[in-house]
């Protein structure tokens, strides 16, 4: 049985793999940050967990996706203010009964040390400092991702 | 009620450095985007650029090689530098906050009431 | 960089009528990020629309914003006094940001 926040998940997920396949980006657009291979987008504004995925998929988007606990510390290196939390990709899946990543992956559990409890309607968010659960009905902000597409160098045969 | 105000001479010699200062007062130079942006006498608007809180900048290419533009978290403040001013950059310069495309406040939300800048020897 | 035309240069309108402005794209403008502002005589730009269509804070609702794509509309449906102005569109979803030439909304 899939709770309302893992059916809101997945039905995103599916409608952005039936999109047509788009170009490289190679540059991040305007207002997105840079961080290495990424465009991150921060909000200044605040929405429940399900509302910021549906945002940052209007955005052509998805929630951030954390990698390893580098990725984080770089994350958390934007956030300037300690009281401000943003919501990233990540929340718990009821049926099985672990972290989930938006994109079906689960949470490897040396990546992240989250404070809270890991239970129903439980969603990840990120401080300058720290990673906590919270419900995810609970209105904070949001942190979208694209993703860039490495440039790789031609190699030309001697002339 | 966040507030800009602009500060900076009001007569600049041509080849010298434009510099303008906008204080934000009543909120936080966090998450938003802040914009400079001029209007010559009678005419339309220009967009010079804006600087992130992070300090990472976005500059109008006709303006790029001329345009700094920095910002000082601690202080609430943002400024532009425009060096080689000639008589063409005679104009209002207005301070202003741009909520991106994120949430109620996308686009430029908040202006400064703007200062007059003559290029003039 | 993206080039906004508005059309007309001038309108010529008494209170109580409907004012329709254009606004014209060289190209598409990404998920229809487009404002309006109103600017009087010696004040700072007001934004007025963004999204193409939002209201911004404040702003009454007789201010409308329509279109997508290269063709946008601000319609005011009802001119009050007030409402004599300068209008400019501008557009956010590429850099540089860009602003069309205005349209001045005058007394007939």
């Known amino acids: 049985q899939k709770s309302s926040i893992e059916k809101c998940s997945v039905d995103i997920q599916q409608s952005r793999n039936k999109t047509t396949e788009r170009p490289g980006l190679l540059n991040c657009p305007i207002y997105w940050q840079q961080l290495r291979e990424k465009c991150l987008l921060f909000s200044h504004t605040v929405n429940p967990w399900n509302n910021s995925l549906a945002d940052c998929s209007t955005k052509e988007s998805s929630l951030l996706l954390i990698r390893d606990k580098d990725e984080l510390i770089h994350t958390q290196n934007l956030i300037r203010d300690k009281a401000i939390l943003f919501w990233i990709g990540l929340n718990f899946s009821l049926s099985e009964k672990n972290w989930k990543w938006i994109n079906g992956s689960f949470l490897n559990s040396n990546d992240l040390e989250i404070r809270g409890d890991a239970k129903e309607n439980s969603c990840i968010s990120i401080s300058q400092t720290s990673v906590y659960s919270e419900y995810c009905s609970t209105e904070i902000r949001w942190i979208c991702q694209k993703e860039l597409t490495p440039v790789r160098n031609k190699v030309y045969p001697d002339s | 009620q966040v507030q800009l105000q602009e500060s900076g001479p009001g007569l600049v010699k041509p080849s010298e450095t434009l510099s303008l200062t906008c204080t934000v007062s009543?909120?936080?130079?966090?998450?938003?985007?802040w914009s400079w942006i001029r209007q010559p006498p009678g005419k339309g608007l220009e967009w010079i650029g804006y600087i992130y809180h992070s300090g990472s900048t976005n500059y109008n290419p006709s303006l790029k090689s001329r345009v700094t533009i920095s910002v000082d978290t601690s202080k609430n403040q943002f400024s532009l530098k425009l060096s080689s001013v000639t008589a063409a950059d005679t104009a209002v310069y207005y301070c202003?906050?741009?909520?991106?495309?994120?949430?109620?406040?996308?686009?430029?939300?908040?202006w400064g009431q703007g200062t007059v800048v003559t290029v003039s020897s | 960089e993206v080039v906004l035309t508005q059309t007309p240069g001038t309108l010529s309108l008494s209170p109580g009528e409907r004012a329709t402005l254009s606004c014209r794209a060289s190209q598409v403008i990404s998920s229809s990020y487009l404002a309006w502002y109103q600017q009087k005589p010696g004040q700072a730009p007001r934004l007025l629309i963004f999204g193409a269509s939002s209201r911004a804070t404040g702003i009454p609702d007789r201010f409308s914003g329509s279109g997508s794509g290269t063709d946008f509309t601000l319609t005011i449906s009802r001119l009050e006094p007030a409402d004599f102005a300068v209008y400019y569109c501008q557009q956010y979803g590429s850099s540089p940001l860009t602003f069309g030439g205005g349209t001045k909304v005058e007394i007939k």
């Open positions: 009543g909120g936080s130079i966090s998450f938003y985007y």
């Open positions: 202003a906050r741009d909520g991106g495309i994120v949430g109620v406040t996308e686009a430029i939300d908040i």
